[in-house]
């Protein structure tokens, strides 16, 4: 675009430029080529010799321009059309400029420190000097000249008439600039163009509000000599929460979000989430829904699954193995990362379920206790004669840390029935002699409970290192036994099992083996009050 420093047509009041001498240039009213009223200067002293008529404009601030254009519109009368003017009439005039830091006032143009510098001698277009029919009169000549580079704050233009019949219809002074613009979401300030022969002017842009550029690399453009922007390099992107709309970034409306500048547009909130505010960078999950830390903001919000369905079990008693299987939850919570976790509780045989405690580390889970993708599991090392509650919880990526203890589980309660109900550390070595060993244990069914008095115990023992087939056996109706006729200083393996009137002995398994070494002949008897 052109930045106008002077436009004589813009003034309908007197221009009031300085004319020396006073009988030279004259300011008069006129019309422009669109028939609009303007102020013009004309001089036509063609019949008198040695004309030297000067017209000086007011002071023109150059603004930010260094290369300045001067556009003149004028008519020049053909000397041949003026009778008697052949010897004195001219068909050119001269244009000068004078750089100054301030207005010279109305003095003679040649005064003021430095001499005016000539821009050019201006002649009419060739066709204007040929016409002898008057047609050339009303066709305006337009001539443009470039001055500069200028260094002072401003300048005056001066026109010298040496005897022509000239009407100065318009004087327009301007410099070219690349207009302030927004390109690629970056604002570029108005920038004065250099001359046609110089390099392009590189200008750094500023990202518009709510946008950002590549770090350390702002967008750039180049202002060409003709005042056009060229060669854009880089661009800005709308920040998170904003999207491009023409030349600016607008906030994502409620219900939409944008997580990163790299995405061009706001996206609607994923399922089960919402953005109530403008400029949301993520959407908040609705009540009872959540995202896992590994879910991207674009993921739908999900919720923990419901309980596994149709939990079934089978119990085999020798060895004592509990097998579980189940179906997936009816509601996966909208996720595919469902896993299962098992909780084993050992409970009193009767009474409230609250009288339960974790099974402890002895119970083994196959393939594992937590993080199962399989819908089946096996529990090993259960005790006979105990009651177990096993919970199977369905979990997914948004289940909280306490979810397995929450309500999204299925459970079964299983009684293992009588049998060897002891852990190794629950059988006590009451007395060890060179030829006898006394053992005692907790009754598998609490005293006073139905069936407690009918329980019988079978104790099997053999020398360690001998074949298991060469064992001896004793039976007792009480939870204690003394085995005699043993060899001194010999290590024996003892196994105990219990049976009540229901199942046969063969249905029960022996408890884990315990080892006891009889004393040597010289040793005195000992009463061992602590478990082995």
């Amino acid at each position: 675009e052109e930045v106008i420093l002077l436009d004589s047509k813009a003034s309908q009041a007197e221009l009031g430029w300085t004319a020396l001498p006073s009988n030279g240039w004259e300011e008069i009213s006129g019309v422009d080529e669109h028939d609009r009223p303007i102020r013009t200067y004309q001089v036509c002293n063609v019949l008198e010799p040695n004309q030297d008529n000067w017209l000086q404009t007011g002071w023109i601030s150059r603004g930010r321009g260094q290369r300045i254009f001067v556009e003149l519109q004028f008519t020049l009368r053909d000397c041949s059309s003026i009778p008697g003017a052949a010897g004195t009439c001219k068909e050119t005039f001269n244009v000068y400029y004078l750089e100054t830091e301030a207005d010279l006032g109305r003095g003679r143009p040649r005064l003021g420190g430095s001499r005016p510098r000539k821009i050019d001698t201006i002649a009419a277009d060739e066709s204007f000097t040929q016409g002898d029919l008057g047609e050339r009169k009303m066709k305006l000549n337009t001539e443009v000249r470039e001055i500069g580079p200028l260094s002072r704050r401003g300048f005056h233009l001066a026109f010298q008439d040496v005897g022509a019949c000239v009407a100065l219809v318009s004087v327009r002074v301007y410099y070219k600039q690349c207009r302030a613009t927004v390109r690629g979401l970056a604002t570029f300030p108005a920038t004065a163009a250099e001359s046609a022969f110089s390099t392009l002017v590189e200008v750094a842009g500023t990202c518009v509000a709510h946008s950002e550029g590549e770090p350390g690399s702002p967008p750039r453009m180049h202002c060409g000599a003709d005042g056009e922007w060229l060669v854009p390099v880089g661009r800005c992107s709308c920040s998170a929460g904003f999207q491009e709309r023409g030349d600016f970034c607008e906030a994502c409306p409620p219900g939409f979000y944008k997580v990163s500048p790299r995405r061009p547009l706001c996206s609607p909130c994923p399922e089960h989430s919402r953005a109530l505010e403008n400029a949301s960078t993520f959407c908040v999950c609705q009540d009872s829904y959540a995202r896992s830390p590994t879910d991207p903001p674009s993921a739908s919000c999900t919720r923990p699954p419901s309980a596994p369905r149709d939990l079934q079990y089978s119990l085999s008693r020798s060895p004592l193995v509990l097998r579980l299987r189940w179906l997936p939850p009816a509601d996966s919570g909208g996720r595919s990362d469902v896993t299962y976790s098992l909780l084993c509780l050992r409970c009193g045989r009767e009474g409230p379920a609250g009288a339960c405690e974790p099974c402890g580390p002895r119970v083994a889970f196959l393939p594992r206790q937590a993080g199962l993708r399989e819908r089946a599991a096996t529990l090993l090392h259960l005790r006979p004669g105990a009651r177990y509650t096993v919970r199977v919880a369905a979990l997914n990526g948004v289940s909280g840390p306490a979810a397995a203890a929450g309500t999204t589980y299925a459970q079964v309660t299983v009684s293992t029935g009588p049998g060897a109900p002891w852990e190794e550390d629950e059988i006590r070595r009451d007395r060890v002699e060179p030829q006898s060993v006394s053992l005692s244990w907790r009754e598998p069914i609490p005293a006073g409970a139905p069936g407690a008095n009918d329980t019988e115990y079978e104790i099997r023992y053999y020398e360690k290192g001998q074949s298991e087939q060469t064992y001896s056996m004793v039976k007792t109706g009480a939870p204690t036994v003394t085995v005699t006729n043993l060899k001194p200083a010999t290590r024996y393996v003892f196994q105990i099992r219990a049976a009540s009137p229901g199942p046969s002995w063969e249905a029960q398994s022996f408890n884990p083996s315990i080892e006891v070494q009889t004393l040597g002949e010289a040793a005195s008897g000992s009463r061992d009050q602590s478990p082995a």
């Epitope: 009213s29 006129g30 019309v31 080529e33 009169k137 009303m138 066709k139 337009t142 009407a167 219809v169």
Partner: antibody, heavy 120, light 112 residues
């Protein structure tokens, strides 16, 4: 506002000189760029440009008629005159006075016209 | 002299229609100064002509914007986007690039 009004003899005989006067208001013919011209239109026919005169007294004529035409002005009375020598019946027409538009030689404002009849 | 030819001679239209008048010159109307001096006038019955468009496409003051001019070199067009009753009359194009200034023969815009 710009107005122009033509006046003339109405009827004249062949070989006579036709004198037309244009009286105008709303502008000054001494203003830079101003021009006034004459155009004629035979009944039912097209228009024919005759002559222009400018603020600085420069003149232009239609070459086909130049030898018979004289245009002049009186700035103080806001009048322009056209003389056509040696008229013929072919000169019968409505004559319009026009104000020439700035530096484009277009005819911005027209008078109402005066009918001139050349008849024996 | 530059001959200016207008077509059609007569243009019957319905009110509200678009009308288009063509003007052709025998030589280019581009002046050595770069301007093109082609103008359009309307003469209503019993009135003097009035300027509509000057220098190809510039509407003269007070002319409605339904009138538009276009063209270059030797071929020019006047368009009336929606003809109104007050637009009826004879349209002339004229050139003032070359002396003598010349006019086209006129196009009569009339109701169908």
């Amino acid at each position: 506002q710009v107005t122009l009004k033509e006046s003339g003899p109405g009827i004249l005989q062949p070989s006579q000189t036709l004198s037309l006067t244009c009286s105008f208001s709303g502008f000054s013919l001494s203003s830079s760029g101003m021009g006034v011209g004459w155009i004629r239109q035979p009944s039912g026919k097209s228009l024919e440009w005759l002559a222009n005169i400018w603020w600085d007294d420069d003149k232009s004529y239609n070459p086909a008629l130049k030898s018979r035409l004289t245009i002049s002005k009186d700035n103080s009375r806001n009048q322009v005159f056209l003389k056509i020598a040696n008229v013929d019946t072919a000169d019968t027409a409505t004559y319009y006075c026009v104000r020439v538009g700035g530096y484009g030689d277009y005819f911005a404002y027209w008078g109402q016209g005066t009918l001139v009849t050349v008849s024996t | 002299d530059v001959v200016v030819t207008q077509t059609p001679l007569s243009l019957p239209v319905s009110l509200g229609d678009q009308a288009s008048i063509s003007c052709r010159s025998s030589q280019s109307l581009v002046h050595s100064n770069g301007n093109t001096y082609l103008h359009w006038y309307l003469q209503k019955p019993g009135q003097s002509p009035k300027l509509l468009i000057y220098k190809v496409s510039n509407r003269f003051s007070g002319v409605p914007d339904r009138f538009s001019g276009s063209g270059s070199g030797t071929d020019f067009t006047l368009k009336i986007s929606r003809v109104e009753a007050e637009d009826l009359g004879v349209y002339f194009c004229s050139q003032s690039t070359h002396v003598p200034y010349t006019f086209g023969g006129g196009t009569k815009l009339e109701i169908k």
